[in-house]
């Protein structure tokens, strides 16, 4: 019941290399370095793009008293809302990590609360009631994951490193065209 | 201008084979997955085949599968369809079509090129 | 039978508000994204919506799309003469090997 705004700010979550999708180890033969049209362009992070608040996982900061009732805490809290879009969405050539990128449809990953904290406020009360605590649990941070075909929305799976083993007893395809053959060996990641 | 134009439809046999082209123009090809989806006559969208920037990262229907072959010649700017085993049930208008963005929806689009399969 | 199920057919007043939807499966729209797609007579389909709901641009913001669940839908507010189309919904589908699924099409009439 009681929330009332005080104010607020955004923080991105750049994503992390050992939380989403990396690039290949080898990336001598990577034609998105070598395309003369490309201006070789180096390789880039996976989820890197020009508008990154389109694509990214944002912690908007909001400070808040906490109510009940009549009551009020004496100081504001600070708790995150995640905001934002989950990638992958962007130009193809650079997504080289794994999944099957090509496709026009794929994983819906969704900005949802990863960690909480508890904080214990003071309410103060009018007519000179003695001051109650309370513990309120508040989001500590945000994190991208995965609406599975297994669960409903309400039970998402973590997007971690983990989901970069291949296949059990699959095995992988030779390196034949470069960076981008790396692709076989990861297709089945999601 | 971004352009995807589609040929070698025609009339054919069931039994028969077609190929079709697709050529591009005014992007960057090998920056796009390409596609093959079909209209029937009066009818929606079905999805016919994927392929990404190379031969291994290709995709099918389940109606198509083992009869159509995709490919692309990055250096031709094209993309094709070789369609072995027509059926009746082939005969449709067929689109060339790709995306520049993953998992971003199909944002390209030739006009199409007619497949009659007819005795 | 498309794996996608929308209504064969919508309808609404210049300047109304018209929603269609569009359904499906834990293996397609359940944990895939959504995509939809309009096709004026007579020409190609053309991206509307791509990831549920982000615009490509040079599409007005009175196009928006959604999910919840196994269902998506896609709102057109103001609705206007050359919006008389059909609207086709998509997304891949997990199931054995996998395919990119097309629902069947509503076909949207500007009415008056």
């Known amino acids: 019941q009681g929330w009332q705004a005080f104010k607020n700010d955004a923080t991105e979550i750049i994503p992390e290399l050992g939380e989403y999708p990396e690039p290949p180890p080898e990336l001598e033969n990577n034609k998105t370095m070598n395309r003369a049209e490309n201006g070789g362009r180096p390789p880039h992070h996976p989820f890197e793009t020009k508008d990154v608040s389109e694509y990214s996982c944002r912690e908007l900061h909001f400070t808040r008293y906490v109510t009940d009732g009549q009551c009020r805490s004496a100081k504001p809290v600070t708790e995150l809302v995640c905001s934002g879009q989950c990638g992958p969405a962007r130009l193809l050539p650079n997504a080289i990590g794994r999944g099957k990128w090509w496709r026009p449809s794929g994983p819906d990953f969704r900005c949802i609360p990863d960690r909480y904290r508890a904080q214990r406020v003071q309410l103060l009360c009018p007519g000179g009631a003695a001051p109650r605590a309370r513990k309120v649990r508040l989001v500590a941070s945000c994190k991208c994951k995965r609406l599975t075909r297994f669960h409903n929305q309400s039970e998402l799976k973590d997007f971690g490193p983990e989901a970069a083993r291949p296949q059990k007893g699959r095995k992988p395809r030779p390196r034949a065209r470069g960076a981008k053959a790396n692709q076989a060996e990861l297709e089945n990641a999601y | 201008e971004v352009q995807l134009v589609e040929s070698g439809g025609g009339l054919v046999q069931p039994g028969r084979s077609l190929r079709l082209s697709c050529a591009a123009s005014g992007f960057t090809f090998d920056d796009y997955a390409l596609h093959w989806v079909r209209q029937a006559p009066g009818k929606g969208l079905e999805w016919v085949s994927g392929i990404g920037w190379e031969d291994d990262m290709i995709d099918y229907a389940d109606s198509v599968k083992g009869r159509f072959t995709i490919s692309r010649d990055n250096a031709k700017n094209s993309l094709y369809l070789q369609m072995n085993s027509l059926r009746v049930e082939d005969t449709a208008l067929y689109y060339c079509?790709?995306?520049?963005?993953?998992?971003?929806?199909?944002?390209?689009w030739g006009q199409g090129t007619t497949v009659t399969v007819s005795s | 039978q498309s794996v996608l199920t929308q209504p064969p057919s919508a309808s609404g007043t210049p300047g109304q508000r018209v929603t269609i939807s569009c359904s499906g499966s834990s293996s397609n729209i359940g944990g895939n994204t959504v995509n939809w797609y309009q096709q004026l007579p007579g020409t190609a389909p053309k991206l509307l919506i791509y990831?549920?709901?982000q615009r490509p641009s040079g599409v007005p913001d009175r196009f928006s799309g959604s999910k919840s669940g196994t269902s998506a839908s896609l709102a057109i507010s103001g609705l206007q003469s050359e919006d008389e189309a059909d609207y086709y919904c998509?997304?891949?589908?997990?199931?054995?090997?996998?395919?990119?699924?097309f629902g069947g099409g509503t076909k949207l009439t500007v009415l008056g």
């Open positions: 998509a997304a891949w589908d997990d199931s054995l090997e996998g395919s990119y699924v």
């Open positions: 079509a790709g995306n520049s963005r993953g998992y971003g929806g199909l944002d390209v």
């Open positions: 990831s549920n709901n």
